[in-house]
Interface confidence: low
């Protein structure tokens, strides 16, 4: 069994926004400027994040919470807590190591971020293509040709699906 500690850790009394200062006989000292402690009982304060360059400040640092960053226009956040800013591309493009590249035929991206994805294969659901896909938009699937009433005009069925390519790196 575990014995209960007879002496309480003096640092446990230090609230958020302070640190237990070993250099001053473990008294609770306020976090210095540009630092914070978000929980009690800390032996150090953490340096505030600085939102520089492509990062901009979404929330200022306080003694009890870190600054929060987002990205300047033309970039978007990636990673935990916006740890990185990635360049935006246009709709119909994806970001590669060589910059923004147009989506390959058969793929689309309707956002300024992320990757090109294959058009929906309508025939897999027994449907036909109602509106053709573009680099920016997925195809729109309509009713299956059999569902169309006689005499109704039918959109040309799609070519056989092929494995979509990827933008060159």
């Amino acid at each position: 069994f575990e014995r209960t500690r007879s002496l309480q850790d003096p640092c446990s009394n230090c609230p958020a926004g302070t640190f237990c200062d070993n250099n001053r006989n473990q008294i609770c000292s306020p976090c210095p400027p540009n630092s914070f402690s978000s929980a009690g009982g800390q032996r150090t304060c953490d340096i505030c994040r600085q939102c520089k360059g492509v990062f901009r400040t979404r929330k200022e640092c306080s003694s009890t919470s870190n600054a929060e960053c987002d990205c300047t226009p033309g970039f978007h956040c990636l990673g935990a807590g916006c740890s990185m800013c990635e360049q935006d591309c246009k709709q119909g493009q994806e970001l590669t190591k060589k910059g923004c590249k147009d989506c390959c035929f058969g793929t689309f991206n309707d956002q300024k971020r992320g990757i090109c994805r294959p058009w929906t294969n309508c025939s897999l659901d027994g449907k036909s293509v109602l509106v053709n896909g573009t680099k920016e938009r997925d195809v729109v699937c309509g009713p299956s040709p059999a569902d169309l009433s006689p005499g109704a005009s039918s959109v040309t069925p799609p070519a056989p699906a092929r494995e979509p390519g990827h933008s060159p790196q």
Epitope: V54, A80, C85, L95
Partner: antibody, heavy 121, light 107 residues
Framework: QVQLVQSGAEVKKPGSSVKLSCKAS????????INWVRQAPGQGLEWMGN????????NYNQKFKDRVTLTVDKSTSTAYMELSSLRSEDTAVYYC??????????????WGQGTLVTVSS | DIQMTQSPSSLSASLGERVTITCKAS??????LSWYQQKPGKAPKLLIY???RLVDGVPSRFSGSGSGQDFTLTISSLQPEDIATYYC?????????FGGGTKVEIK
């Protein structure tokens, strides 16, 4: 060309500290995170933490948070990793590797040659 | 932390044979997975990122697939220079975590 050149092998006593360096060249030092990854003999890879040279912002693996300190010297484009309270299980090759700030998929694209740290009494 | 389970831990294959290595994440990591090759005494080398994108200069016999939790690295025709240990890495969340590695040997 991009190069990350690490300091030489170290032999340390248990309980002591070691400070390794990683000198970068061939790219804009401040635009890439420097990560530290270690590999114990015959074992896998383990991420320890990273630092963004522009503002020295750091992320640490909780496993190492109390023992690792990451710093940079922008004037020499050098990153440092200090590991304290060394124990025998810290014997490993320590690598520095980089990640581009602006492109999330550039994870660990270039690596240093590694530094062997041996902890032995 | 996200756990990455890589299998098999080692395999033996003949030259020219197709080799498949799998990596399973303990949670959805989108496509934020990369593959590394490491030869003895050397640093790892990035082969594939975003699950299926080949790094410039890496032979086309290497390919990656998968998304979500299940990922595969395939060597379509094993060559002598492919003898190495291969690691997957998830970078969807901090801390980035590696699989345990797969050692590929010649039969």
């Amino acid at each position: 060309q991009v190069q990350l050149v690490q300091s030489g092998a170290e032999v340390k006593k248990p309980g002591s500290s070691v400070k390794l360096s990683c000198k970068a060249s061939g790219y804009t030092f401040s635009s890439y995170w420097i990560n530290w990854v270690r590999q114990a003999p015959g074992q896998g890879l383990e991420w320890m933490g990273n630092i963004y040279p522009s503002d020295s912002y750091t992320n640490y693996n909780q496993k190492f948070k109390d023992r690792v300190t990451l710093t940079v010297d922008k004037s020499t484009s050098t990153a440092y990793m200090e590991l304290s309270s060394l124990r025998s299980e810290d014997t490993a090759v320590y690598y520095c590797t980089r990640t581009w700030e602006f492109y999330y998929d550039s994870v660990f694209d270039y690596w240093g040659q590694g530094t062997l740290v041996t902890v032995s009494s | 932390d996200i756990q990455m389970t890589q299998s098999p831990s080692s395999l033996s294959a003949s030259l020219g044979e197709r080799v498949t290595i799998t990596c399973k994440a303990s949670q959805d990591i989108n496509s934020y997975l990369s593959w590394y090759q490491q030869k003895p005494g050397k640093a790892p080398k990035l082969l594939i990122y975003r699950a299926n994108r080949l790094v410039d200069g890496v032979p086309s016999r290497f390919s990656g697939s998968g998304s979500g939790q299940d990922f595969t690295l395939t060597i379509s025709s094993l060559q002598p220079e492919d003898i190495a240990t291969y690691y997957c890495l998830q970078y969807d969340e901090l801390p980035p975590t590696f699989g345990g590695g797969t050692k590929v040997e010649i039969k």
